[in-house]
Amino acid sequence: SGPVKELVGSVGGAVTFPLKSKVKQVDSIVWTFNTTPLVTIQPEGGTIIVTQNRNRERVDFPDGGYSLKLSKLKKNDSGIYYVGIYSSSLQQPSTQEYVLHVYEHLSKPKVTMGLQSNKNGTCVTNLTCCMEHGEEDVIYTWKALGQAANESHNGSILPISWRWGESDMTFICVARNPVSRNFSSPILARKLCEGAADDPDSSMV
């Protein structure tokens, strides 16, 4: 039994659970998902039993091996997978555990503006970046672009301080997860501060 293997997949995509077996005489191979049997293979008779009908179309064993390929991944396919190789030549089954994380492809992140103040010709506010559907494991980075700056800021909240009369700046939020990345519509400091000067309440940008 080897160490737990971590695998990553994307919604709608496919993932292969690699299985290299040195066992000579294999009686059966059982793949399990979160303690529920998924597939049983009996190599002798060439039998493959997929426990649940809904998985029949999604399960494959490429290249005639015993590595399990799972297609049309869904978010709830995330979890622990376990394979046991049973043989009369082994006292204990040979086992391998996998952890699968399935992530969604990220849509464009949304940006909201916090309360804003305009003091001494300086516009001060926060921009907050988030995913509409609350996707997990998202890392946010802000790009602040302008003649005087090209800076990155980590985190979902970007504090802004922009002085009227300065050259305009553009802010872009970049969202990333392990399988995709996307960016917000660009936000111009001048437009942001003009709009917020009229309406001090928090608003969508």
Partner: antibody, heavy 119, light 107 residues
Framework: EVQLVESGGGLVQPGGSLRLSCAAS????????MSWVRQAPGKGLEWIGE????????NYAPSLKDKFIISRDNAKNSLYLQMNSLRAEDTAVYYC????????????WGQGTLVTVSS | DIQMTQSPSSLSASVGDRVTITCKAS??????VAWYQQKPGKVPKLLIY???TRHTGVPDRFSGSGSGTDFTLTISSLQPEDVATYYC?????????FGQGTKLEIK
Amino acid sequence: EVQLVESGGGLVQPGGSLRLSCAASGFDFSRYWMSWVRQAPGKGLEWIGEINPDSSTINYAPSLKDKFIISRDNAKNSLYLQMNSLRAEDTAVYYCARPDGNYWYFDVWGQGTLVTVSS
Amino acid sequence: DIQMTQSPSSLSASVGDRVTITCKASQDVGIAVAWYQQKPGKVPKLLIYWASTRHTGVPDRFSGSGSGTDFTLTISSLQPEDVATYYCQQYSSYPYTFGQGTKLEIK
């Protein structure tokens, strides 16, 4: 020094296959999305596709999806392009490219490897 | 796919001239546009990204502007070493696409 070096190009017959490699050095290859871009002789640039750091997402140009396969081996700091059913119009210099700061624009390019499809 | 149409396809200008290359996207790409320079026999080199941000080490005679569908690369004072083909690229949506290129020569 950040570097990408392609290899595996050459002359191949129509209908044949070829596997290109790109060896990366000077940066943490396993953290970057990587792309392949090609350029036919005297023509413009064409994006082939990209692969994410752990190979769980591969995006292709739709017109090339069924004939090209992108893969990578982070342990070897290598990116690959498997090309099948090659035709004369696939004759091009093939570049691997790294996006700046993992964004979408390419700041590091390999020197390119020429693939010629001809009988 | 989003088409990126560059104009002109080639141009000849004198040293010191102001040179403008345009790129038109077939649909709105925001500011997700990059510009590259490719000298004869060399690999492409990133000049501009996010439509107007100069890449590290790029001389300030190069500037980019535009948003939505219309983008411009400007060389304020053409130098002999600027002889190259220039490409725009959109990265707003898949597949990433490049313009057909603008070949710049010195008169």
